[in-house]
Interface confidence: low
């Protein structure tokens, strides 16, 4: 069908509440493109009728609410004048009773649902709410172990819960709740967040910092060999994975057959109170398909990309 498959995105979702996913993939979606959503390789697009429980809203797919039978792979097709790209999104719906202590945690929680507070610091938790502008979100309520959070140490600021002077007792299971209004109907969004406490101090906390790349472009001639380092500072006791990905896939897996683009061996240097890691990506031969594609360096929750671009023509 002439469409390039970009990547597979996996999402774990809670049943019986709204969910939305935005089909955005810069730089592809930054130009004049049309976006169409499909389910499970169906030829029939997802409805654009706003009264439908599942419908497309501009570039978003919106579930009001998500139900058990909605699990599956959804495709978003991005068509430009001379291009076609397809993103696959694998949605898995699970039943989670946030206040049911017999349910032991969640499978493969994303980083949005696992957050860290720093002992003795003023810190915050974030309620991640990704919905199109047709969805109106009310004020957020916060709960810990199923009780609404009160007390002068806690302040709600937009989508954040500010926690002053974090103590060990602040670890546990939190939830943020918000009422979402869409076309006159109201739905409850309840996001559970597992909170752990770290004693790490210093400027970086426990979030790895990618020094390079900086979401920048690199001019490189077609056919040349290119090696790019990803430099990361992180705490000495970190357990973060560091890797290069393209289209949300490890480069070694994505280029498994040709081995044209490979991730290098990670090295690190130990400083006074942190480590500096270097992991490179090698392009044995830069091809046309590499241009304009974000090659992402990941370190724990941090990510940054390089994008290859052709050098400007020299008219001298």
């Amino acid at each position: 069908d002439g469409c390039n498959d970009i990547f597979m995105k996996n999402e774990m979702l809670s049943a019986s509440q709204p969910f939305a996913f935005n089909c955005t993939f810069p730089p592809i979606t930054s130009g004049e493109v049309s976006v169409t959503w499909y389910k499970n390789s169906s030829k029939i697009p997802v409805s654009k009728i706003i009264q439908s429980r599942i419908h497309q809203d501009e570039t978003w797919i919106l579930f009001l609410p998500m139900e058990w039978g909605d699990s599956g792979v959804y495709q978003c097709v991005i068509k430009g004048r001379d291009s076609c790209h397809r993103i696959h999104v694998n949605l898995t719906v699970f039943e989670k009773q946030w206040c049911d202590t017999s349910v032991k945690g969640l499978p493969n929680l994303s980083d949005e649902y696992k957050q860290i507070l720093h002992l003795g610091k003023d810190d915050s938790l974030t309620c991640h709410l990704h919905f199109p502008k047709s969805c109106i979100l009310g004020p957020i309520k916060w709960y810990k172990d199923c009780n609404e959070i009160t007390g002068e140490r806690f302040t709600v600021l937009e989508t954040r819960l500010l926690v002053s002077n974090v103590s060990a007792e602040d670890r546990g299971n939190y939830a943020c709740q918000v009422i979402l209004t869409h076309s006159g109907k109201q739905y409850e969004v309840l996001n559970g967040i597992t909170v752990s406490i770290t004693e790490r101090a210093g400027y970086g906390g426990s979030v790895p910092k990618i020094i390079y790349p900086k979401n920048n472009s690199i001019e490189v001639q077609l056919g040349t060999t290119l090696i790019v380092d990803c430099n990361i500072t992180d705490t000495k006791d970190n357990t973060n994975l560091r890797c290069w990905r393209v289209n949300n896939t490890l480069v070694d897996d994505y280029y498994n057959e040709s081995k044209r683009i490979r991730e290098g061996v990670e090295t690190h240097a130990s400083f006074r109170e942190y480590n500096l890691y270097t992991v490179n990506i090698t392009f044995l031969e830069v091809k046309m398909e590499d241009y304009g594609l974000p090659f992402m360096c990941h370190a724990g929750v941090s990510a940054a990309y390089i994008m290859l671009q052709l050098p400007a023509p020299d008219f001298r």
Epitope: Y203, K209, I211
Partner: antibody
């Protein structure tokens, strides 16, 4: 914006103790490294030592027997004391801290410096 | 102690020149830091972790090196670049600076 400001007497008599204060704003000294460096007139920079957020101190071995770095977290200040000074301790004294791009060793924020002259 | 030796100690150059300052360590260091200092002012972090430019540093500056030999290069000298440059290592305490390289207008 992190700002550091040194203060203390500009003239100290030989054999006395040099005492300087670094007042920090825009950051808490309960996080990161807080360093002292000096610049001898017409010469290069010399690293004196640091106090870490935990209270741990490190001193350059060449000065270790004479130097003390301390702090007062309630005032967000840290201090340098250098005992038994001689004319060789005449220098511009700087307080500085790192943390640029989360690299704590990169001394990004500096005070403007204070000239201390040792003379009778 | 790791001794840091910068060369040259002073350098006269003209606007537009390409300038290289070298810093040699008496034993291996992992990374080099460079600072720029102008008369009567505090040093400014210029290059960190060998090759990363600090905020506001023009792209005509670059840093490179490994082991015991590191360089700071200015591709096309500008009037505001005339200053003293110091290298520093944080690999092994005591954390030593080079003696400085004074860059002057020819």
């Amino acid at each position: 914006q992190v700002q550091l400001q040194e203060s203390g007497p500009g003239l100290v008599k030989p054999s006395q103790t040099l005492s300087l204060t670094c007042t920090v704003s825009g950051a808490s000294i309960t996080s990161g490294y807080w360093n002292w460096i000096r610049n001898h007139p017409g010469k290069g920079l010399e690293y004196i030592g640091y106090i870490y957020y935990s209270g741990y101190t490190y001193y350059n071995p060449s000065l270790k027997s004479r130097v003390t770095i301390s702090r007062d977290t309630s005032k967000n200040q840290y201090y340098l004391k250098l005992s038994s000074v001689t004319a060789a301790d005449t220098a511009v004294y700087y307080c500085a801290t790192g943390g640029y791009d989360y690299v704590e060793d990169a001394l990004y924020y500096w005070g403007q410096g204070t000239l201390v002259t040792v003379s009778s | 102690d790791i001794q840091m030796t910068q060369s040259p100690s002073s350098l006269s150059a003209s606007v537009g020149d390409r300038v290289t300052i070298t810093c040699r360590a008496s034993s291996n260091v992992r990374y080099m830091y460079w600072y720029q200092q102008k008369p009567g002012k505090a040093p400014k972090l210029w290059i960190y972790l060998t090759s990363n430019l600090a905020s506001g540093v023009p792209s005509r500056f670059s840093g490179s090196g490994s082991g015991t030999s590191y360089t700071l290069t200015i591709s096309s000298l500008q009037p505001e670049d005339f200053a003293t440059y110091y290298c520093q290592q944080f690999t092994t305490s005591p954390y030593t600076f080079g003696q400085g390289t004074k860059l002057e207008i020819k």
